[in-house]
């Protein structure tokens, strides 16, 4: 089997003049192409891989939402020579850039890495953007993370930074076929210069308070109870509870009014994320859907 082979990291690495043709190893009977697009409220970029694949022919599209960062993944596998150049890598995968001047800044600034290399997205060197609120979604958190796409035995990764709807998420992520978008959120302007080592401490976790030992009393009715006013003792280590695999916990903080309405529950997914997959969980969304192929 012959397949097209290329890697695109927010560039033109899979343009027709840069694609190569490779002969697949014996036993490999599918060509694969995978595209992952990520969009912040300040722009979008895409990753793509083409090459010799594994598994069965088929197509898999999925939409993901991580605190207002949107991602769209397309995976296509086919069994003919050089059949893996069907996906359009140049068309806008998500939405057009809006007229940002129409949205007043909300006072928060974040470092922004949208299609920047890892070298260009280090520390305080990336550009700074002003966050704004889209509809009644409040983008007052800053995000620092990575997007990774794996296909055809190749893994490509780029940093992602920008404004998000959550200020406290820690090592949070969403996944699709061969795709991961993950990272951490923080509160305050330009707080997202490096969140790789962020721990799970959060203002939303109530502090542990050491109560004084009870004093022996003879007449309980005359004893007043007092609580310690000393600084709360914080745990030396915390663990992040994992969401139950069969339900989606609601996002904390500002939530879109309509999302409180009754809807079918998603299965799987991390807290606060929406997996907009076309796997049939939402048959009304997007019209008639083709069944997923297990090979994708």
């Amino acid at each position: 089997l012959e397949c097209y082979s290329c890697v695109q990291k927010a560039d033109d690495g899979c343009s027709p003049n840069k694609m190569k043709t490779v002969k697949c190893a014996p036993g490999v009977d599918v060509c694969t192409e995978a595209v992952g697009a990520v969009e912040t409220i300040h722009g979008q970029f895409s990753l793509a891989v083409r090459g010799c694949g594994s598994g069965l022919p088929g197509k898999n599209d999925r939409g993901l939402d991580l605190h207002g960062l949107l991602a769209f993944i397309q995976l296509q596998q086919c069994a003919q020579d050089r059949c893996n150049a069907k996906l359009n890598l140049t068309s806008r995968a998500l939405d057009p850039a809006g007229n940002e001047s129409a949205y007043p800044p909300n006072g928060v600034e974040c470092y922004s890495c949208v299609g920047l290399s890892r070298e260009a997205c280090q520390g305080t060197s990336p550009p700074v953007v002003s966050c704004y609120n889209a509809s009644d979604h409040v983008y007052k958190g800053c995000f620092d993370g990575n997007v990774t796409l794996t296909a055809a035995n190749v893994t490509v990764s780029l940093p992602v930074r920008g404004c998000v709807q959550d200020e406290f998420c820690t090592r949070d992520g969403v996944t699709g076929p061969g795709f991961t978008l993950s990272g951490s959120c923080c509160q305050g302007s330009r707080c997202n210069s490096d969140l790789r080592n962020k721990t799970y401490f959060s203002p939303r976790i109530p502090p542990l308070v050491r109560l004084p030992p009870p004093e022996p009393t003879t007449v309980a009715s005359t004893t007043s109870v007092t609580t310690s006013t000393s600084a709360p003792v914080r745990p030396t280590s915390t663990t992040k509870p994992m969401p139950a695999p069969t339900s989606q916990t609601p996002r904390q903080g500002v939530e879109h009014e309509a999302s409180r309405d009754e809807e079918p529950r998603l299965t799987g997914g991390a807290a606060g994320h929406q997996d907009r997959s076309n796997s049939g969980q939402y048959p009304a969304k997007g019209g008639p859907q083709q069944p997923h192929n297990k090979g994708c």
């Epitope: 999925r62 998500l94 939405d95 809006g98 076309n278």
Partner: nanobody, 124 residues
Framework: QVQLVESGGGLVQPGGSLRLSCAAS????????MGWFRQAPGKEREIVAA????????YYANSVKGRFTISRDNSKNTLYLQMNSLRAEDTAVYYC?????????????????WGQGTLVTVSS
């Protein structure tokens, strides 16, 4: 939840015009991003146009650029699609859709609510 009802479809000659409307009932129409999609027989549902919650971001598919105009009136909870210079290939069922992100999203997978559709037939 938002309920969406399309209207304005019908039979029109090539070169003619139609205006589709999508009336939304339910909560806070103005906070939703909206889109028009269409589906011709035997084809996948495709984006036609999309508009953000406040109307500042607008998207058009290449096949309708310069001919179709999407707009919204948040005070009337209504989305519009003005279709001019219609062609036979515009024949399809047109669907109105809403997304909770409030953005002019292009992919159908990001839309949360859908209307039942209105048929547009362009034929002489």
């Amino acid at each position: 939840q938002v309920q969406l009802v399309e209207s304005g479809g019908g039979l029109v000659q090539p070169g003619g015009s139609l205006r589709l409307s999508c009336a939304a009932s339910g909560r806070s129409f103005s906070s939703y991003g909206m889109g028009w999609f269409r589906q011709a027989p035997g084809k996948e549902r495709e984006i036609v146009a999309a508009i953000s919650w406040g109307g500042s971001a607008v998207y058009y598919a290449n096949s309708v650029k310069g001919r179709f105009t999407i707009s919204r009136d948040n005070s009337k909870n209504t989305l519009y699609l003005q279709m001019n210079s219609l062609r036979a290939e515009d024949t399809a069922v047109y669907y109105c859709a809403a997304n909770r992100q409030g953005r002019a999203l292009v992919r159908k997978e990001f839309y949360d609510y859908w209307g039942q559709g209105t048929l547009v037939t362009v034929s002489s």
